[in-house]
Structure formats: structure tokens, C-alpha cells
């Protein structure tokens, strides 16, 4: 089956959610781990990640179509310390499949705002930190 990983972001007030979505077939979930790394160009692994999610096969899902699993990492207030390059990755302990998402970046600016760049699906986000609005 075709397995792929996408990265996205959303904002709720001051919170920034970084989302790693893995698309896979139901039977491929077992043994899969999804993880998010920061500033790790070569050694992104579950052990060095900020957060990881181990997928489980859900017997409650019928059919053999493609399903998605999401890892969400929430930053309550983005600070200059969050600036850097992030990457969503996944790997299967059963099949040895390894997925690497596109790199995306958080840049905290001198004005106290921040931008998230490099996301696919037209997701270039620019956030005003104080107002918590999408500009």
C-alpha cells in the first residue's frame, strides 16, 4: 500500500499545534511510530524526538481503505527558543519502512510575531503573537 506523511499547523489563540499526519491502510498501523523532531537533519529518531506516537490497529474501523493517524504537538506560547527546523517522521518496526516529511520552520521575529514556513498544502502561516490572530 501507499503510505505517506504530511505536516501541518494550526493556531488556537496563543497555542500553536504542529501536526504530523500519516496516511496508511488499517492493517499497516501495528508497529508504526510517528515522531516529530527539531533541528535534527540526520538523526531524527523516536529517541531524539520531541514527541512520538505508537500506532495501534483499531479493530473498530471497518473496510480496507486508507486511514490517517495524527500526532499533535502543542506549544502554548511560541517563544524565540522555538525558532528552528522541524520534521515529521515515521517508521515501521515490522516492515522497516521509514518516512520523512518535508522540513518546516518556525521563525520568531523581532516584532514578537512568528511565522511557520515550509508546510505543504499552501500552509504558509504568519501569526501575530500578542493578538493570537492569523494575519
Amino acid at each position: 500500500g501507499c503510505i505517506n506523511i504530511t505536516s501541518s499547523a494550526s493556531q488556537e489563540g496563543t497555542r500553536l499545534n504542529l501536526i504530523c499526519t500519516v496516511w496508511h491502510k488499517k492493517e499497516e498501523a501495528e508497529g508504526f511510530v510517528v515522531f516529530l523532531c527539531k533541528d535534527r537533519s540526520g538523526d531524527c529518531s523516536p529517541e531524539t524526538s520531541l514527541k512520538q506516537l505508537r500506532l495501534k490497529r483499531d479493530p473498530g474501523i471497518d473496510g480496507v481503505g486508507e486511514i490517517s493517524s495524527q500526532l499533535m504537538f502543542t506549544i502554548s506560547q511560541v517563544t524565540p527558543l522555538h525558532s528552528g527546523t522541524y520534521q515529521c517522521c515515521a517508521r515501521s518496526q515490522k516492515s522497516g519502512i521509514r518516512l520523512q516529511g518535508h522540513f518546516f520552520s518556525i521563525l520568531f521575529t523581532e516584532t514578537g510575531n512568528y511565522t511557520v514556513t515550509g508546510l505543504k498544502q499552501r500552509q504558509h502561516l504568519e501569526f501575530s503573537h500578542n493578538e493570537g490572530t492569523l494575519s
Epitope: G13, T14, K38, D39, E47, T48, S49, L50, F73, T74, I75, S76, Q77, T79, P80, L81, S83, G84, G112, H129, G132
Partner: antibody, heavy 119, light 107 residues
Framework: EVQLVESGGGFVQPGRSLKLSCAAS????????MAWVRQAPTKGLEWVAS????????YYRDSVKGRFTISRDNAKNTQYLQMDSLRSEDTATYYC????????????WGQGAMVTVSS | EIILTQSPTTMTASPGEKVTITCRAS?????MHWYQQKPGASPKPWIY???KLASGVPDRFSGSGSGTSYSLTINNMEAEDAATYYC??????????FGAGTKLELK
């Protein structure tokens, strides 16, 4: 178990230098931004400096800018605070602390290193 | 720079009493964090993001507030709660600021 152990504190004359170290264990040190927070005797807490996970960016409170330098060695799981041109008002217990990644709270603290600046 | 003003500076409370400590910010802030510190010990995270209890904190503690006014409440004071409590916030560009502390003593 997360452990932060400070060392290097002591008695120093005004204008002199001192370097504090903080040895970290029990977590992936290179993932976390780190900080120094100080507490003058019988006084409150005061943030001093922070450094990002890779060590490339650092931030300071105004009163220590140009005198203090925060740094880290991820291979040694250690962060440092180089304190130059020390003043009597720098007398305090200096705590090493970790930044919680998802929040703006300092979640783990060392036991503190006492720095006394006096002639 | 945002200034955090805690009140009262010192207070005493009897076991079982309800205790409220307040922290006022000179400008609006998004979240407030609280720490507990006992003599000779390091500060411990106590309440984060205004109302979430840190690991191991008894549920007699609660936090609330928004904008410039925040509070920490103990519903039934116990002897082990005697300590100094500090509020803390993050704001750009002043970064991290703490209140001066509230010393809570057992009556």
C-alpha cells in the same frame, strides 16, 4: 529520573569572573532549551539567561547583558554560565533549569550554586 | 517589562482554611505559572498555564485568572502547604518575569 547538578559557585571579588556548570542526566539534553534563574539571599526568583536546544541562540536579562554568557555542550550534557565583571548585586543562588518544550514554565531545577560577590 | 505584583506578601492560615494568593500583571498576559518553594530547597513547578496542576500536586490546589489578574487557591490548608509561592509569566521582549513571592505560614 531527571537530574541537574550545578557546580562552580563560590566567593569572588567584584570585577572578577566565575564560571558555573550544570551537568544534566535522565533526559535527552539536546532536545531542550535551558536556563539559569537566580535568587538573592531572602529575595525572590529572577530569570538570568536562556539558551536554545542547539546552543546557537541565547537570551539575557538586561542587567547581565554583556557580562554573562550562557553556553552548552550537548556532547557532555552540560550547560554553563560564564560570569564576568561581577557585581555585589549578582550575589545569589544560581539555579540551572530546563524549559518545558510545550509551555513557558521551568519544569526541572537543580539544587543551586551559591555565588557571593564581595570585597 | 511586565511587573507581577503578588499579594499578600506574607500570610498565615489554619489547617482546613481556604487560602487565596493573587498575582496582578502590569499588562495583560496569556498564562500564569506558579511555583512552590520551601526553605533550603529549589522551586517546584506547582501550577502551569494558569490552571493545570503539575505532577504530584494535591487537588486541593487550583489556579484561575485571565488578563491581568490571576490567583492560586488552596481549598483546605494543610501543614505541608506552608511555603513561599511565586507566580511567573512569559512575554516578549522582557521574556521571563516572576512575582516577589507570597510566604504562607501555618497558624
Amino acid at each position: 529520573e531527571v537530574q541537574l547538578v550545578e557546580s562552580g559557585g563560590g566567593f569572588v571579588q567584584p570585577g572578577r569572573s566565575l564560571k558555573l556548570s550544570c551537568a544534566a542526566s535522565g533526559f535527552t539534553f539536546s532536545n531542550y532549551a535551558m536556563a539559569w534563574v537566580r535568587q538573592a539571599p531572602t529575595k525572590g526568583l529572577e530569570w538570568v539567561a536562556s539558551i536554545n536546544s542547539g546552543g546557537g541562540d541565547s537570551y539575557y536579562r538586561d542587567s547581565v547583558k554583556g557580562r554573562f554568557t550562557i553556553s552548552r555542550d550537548n556532547a557532555k550534557n552540560t550547560q554553563y554560565l560564564q560570569m564576568d565583571s561581577l557585581r555585589s548585586e549578582d550575589t545569589a543562588t544560581y539555579y540551572c533549569a530546563t524549559h518545558n518544550y510545550g509551555s513557558t514554565i521551568f519544569d526541572y531545577w537543580g539544587q543551586g550554586a551559591m555565588v557571593t560577590v564581595s570585597s | 517589562e511586565i511587573i507581577l505584583t503578588q499579594s499578600p506578601t506574607t500570610m498565615t492560615a489554619s489547617p482546613g482554611e481556604k487560602v487565596t494568593i493573587t498575582c496582578r500583571a502590569s499588562s495583560s498576559v496569556s498564562y500564569m505559572h506558579w511555583y512552590q518553594q520551601k526553605p533550603g530547597a529549589s522551586p517546584k513547578p506547582w501550577i502551569y498555564e494558569t490552571s493545570k496542576l503539575a505532577s504530584g500536586v494535591p487537588d486541593r490546589f487550583s489556579g484561575s485568572g485571565s488578563g491581568t489578574s490571576y490567583s492560586l487557591t488552596i481549598n483546605n490548608m494543610e501543614a505541608e502547604d506552608a511555603a513561599t509561592y511565586y507566580c511567573q509569566q512569559w512575554n516578549y521582549p522582557s521574556m521571563y518575569t516572576f512575582g516577589a513571592g507570597t510566604k504562607l505560614e501555618l497558624k
